[in-house]
Amino acid sequence: EAGLPRAGGGSQPPFRTFSASDWGLTHLVVHEQTGEVYVGAVNRIYKLSGNLTLLRAHVTGPVEDNEKCYPPPSVQSCPHGLGSTDNVNKLLLLDYAANRLLACGSASQGICQFLRLDDLFKLGEPHHRKEHYLSSVQEAGSMAGVLIAGPPGQGQAKLFVGTPIDGKSEYFPTLSSRRLMANEEDADMFGFVYQDEFVSSQLKIPSDTLSKFPAFDIYYVYSFRSEQFVYYLTLQLDTQLTSPDAAGEHFFTSKIVRLCVDDPKFYSYVEFPIGCEQAGVEYRLVQDAYLSRPGRALAHQLGLAEDEDVLFTVFAQGQKNRVKPPKESALCLFTLRAIKEKIKERIQSCYRGEGKLSLPWLLNKELGCINSPLQIDDDFCGQDFNQPLGGTVTIEGTPLFVDKDDGLTAVAAYDYRGRTVVFAGTRSGRIRKILVDLSNPGGRPALAYESVVAQEGSPILRDLVLSPNHQYLYAMTEKQVTRVPVESCVQYTSCELCLGSRDPHCGWCVLHSICSRRDACERADEPQRFAADLLQCVQL
């Protein structure tokens, strides 16, 4: 199934690719030590080398199934007719500590498998207990998870996972934290981290909400850990704007959800509307996000330390059409410091007894905040009251770049020698390379300096991932993975073209008269051996 290397256009050498003609690709992860690439697909999990040759394929479907069978037919006979059913990979996570891959599918009510990293041998799947089923929803880009390793030598790993539930709130929580046991056959595998008569490590969409808004669901776009918190970027039906009338127009809102890593009772649950605005246009439909560090220059411009987290996000314009959002989209920047501060202010306000909990989809009643002497600091993880808590004001990001024509679909970023480079995938299969610099002349906070084709005409999917050495970017469409070099300096044939490109990777290597990275240029640190500024071209 491996495809032939294919030309990337222009004078660039062909990019390495992997093609899956039969099965749609859904997720991609890269092992941070080995550089090997794991790809989730419909009915398959693939293991590829760093240069995208196929090493292993593991078959996950089709299976004889019916989503009305609960538990699945493999466990208990079912009165509904069975049919050959695709198993869509919806979550793919590397469990480094246990040397295994977690692959969650849509079949059998949404169970997960563990595969050995070396050879994709199936290590086990959970015992069929009610809480082991995550969700039978087939939409691939709607589930997100964060794997939290247990403390070294002791403690248990856990999985925070969010998923749409397609109205089946009695079966599936929308958000939960699950135990990950060392032994894949352990009966407690995927059990809730905590469960008692009153509370457990899960949130369910109340049946009242689904009665009033049958289409209500929460779609999880991106998740990450930052410090002691787990965050999710979600899209959910906006119950304030959407009429309960099923025939009416649906409006969506993007929310950032936060939980404390060590909060098994989910008392720390907070969600805030999130988005950004440019020139009076609101961008409210989150498409993708990427957690990164800012790079020396950007950190200085933002007043951050270099080791603080920032979040690059892509939003489509407006609040309609979740599945086919408008092409107009924006790349935006958030600092985790600002997000945390906004959330803390809201919690503090509520603990002063001000306002309401403001979470209509979850509470189904307007609960007032209760005044309390508890001290609310940056690390506060909630109590049994004043929770769950909703933000009433949208957390606004800084717009960096607006694409009115192509539509941004995916984002990744990294720090190259102190400068922040963002890669944005588009609807037409291109990768835009963007230099973020808030001190740019003319007030443009970002410069799109290059655009390359990964796969013409096919939208770039969300999992845009850098290789461990930051030399390549893996871009995935439904049918192909493409390895795109982060730079193509060699295409620029003169000093002026090289430095005029504004590619932060590129400089003019005087000794060989080629455009290259600094680390590829001999004696680059000697005077007048490596030009990194357009003015130096004239001097040379």
Partner: antibody, heavy 122, light 107 residues
Framework: QVQLQQSGPGLVKPSQTLSLTCAIS??????????WNWIRQSPSRGLEWLGR?????????DYAVSVKSRITINPDTSKNQFSLQLNSVTPEDTAVYYC????????????WGQGTLVTVSS | SYELTQPPSVAVSPGQTASITCSGH??????ASWYQQKPGQSPVLVIY???KRPSGIPERFSGSNSGNTATLTISGTQAMDEADYYC??????????FGTGTKVTVL
């Protein structure tokens, strides 16, 4: 199973201090998910919440406005108990006094002590 | 200060439904709990978070809360349900308030 066992005198003279203790078994007074309350009941006032103590990284107290100036609720971690002190009592403070546990504002008082009738009389 | 008002008494025939109301300003914006107390005994929690029953409480006890009124409903009332019933909520300044109490008599 959580149990709360109350102890203390049944008769207190006016202007003196009412002191009661509630011993906890099956839970910890330092639990970060419980609070420990004193509630009283009299024919004239019905059930009346007096206050509570709870630990959330440090100790906190909430008191009813009606008794705020003369009440103290203290935890005793070494004995896993908590106590009520009500100063300057009058016959109006005659009531059955209960200790009770709550697990948060929305969970109600799920365990109660057996109650102690305290009479304030000279 | 915040107040919760209940009817002093409710009479019900065995097997019938008894409804006890509890009124307070915007009570629906708070969580209500309900307690049963029999003579000479400590109160027992029968409903918390408006509608939820602790383990061991029969299904015939149910609760609701909206607007300014919380309601405890005992369906298929039995003789053993004869008792005093109290509603309870916390006000926004973290002070606990009990209702005035309702005596339920099973005829």
């Amino acid at each position: 199973q959580v149990q709360l066992q109350q102890s203390g005198p049944g008769l207190v003279k006016p202007s003196q201090t009412l002191s009661l203790t509630c011993a906890i078994s099956g839970d910890s007074v330092s639990s970060n998910s419980a609070a420990w309350n004193w509630i009283r009941q009299s024919p004239s006032r019905g059930l009346e919440w007096l206050g509570r103590t709870y630990y959330r990284s440090k100790w906190y107290n909430d008191y009813a406005v009606s008794v705020k100036s003369r009440i103290t609720i203290n935890p005793d971690t070494s004995k896993n108990q908590f106590s009520l002190q009500l100063n300057s009592v009058t016959p109006e403070d005659t009531a059955v006094y209960y200790c009770a546990r709550d697990r948060g504002y929305s969970y109600g008082f799920d365990y109660w002590g057996q109650g102690t009738l305290v009479t304030v009389s000279s | 200060s915040y107040e919760l008002t209940q009817p002093p008494s409710v009479a019900v025939s065995p097997g019938q439904t008894a409804s006890i109301t509890c009124s307070g300003h915007k009570l629906g914006e708070k969580y209500a709990s309900w307690y049963q107390q029999k003579p000479g005994q400590s109160p027992v929690l029968v409903i918390y978070q408006d509608t939820k029953r602790p383990s061991g409480i029969p299904e015939r006890f149910s609760g609701s809360n909206s607007g300014n009124t919380a309601t405890l409903t005992i369906s298929g009332t039995q003789a053993m349900d004869e008792a005093d019933y109290y509603c309870q909520a916390w006000d926004s300044s973290s002070v606990c308030v009990f209702g005035t109490g309702t005596k339920v008599t099973v005829l």
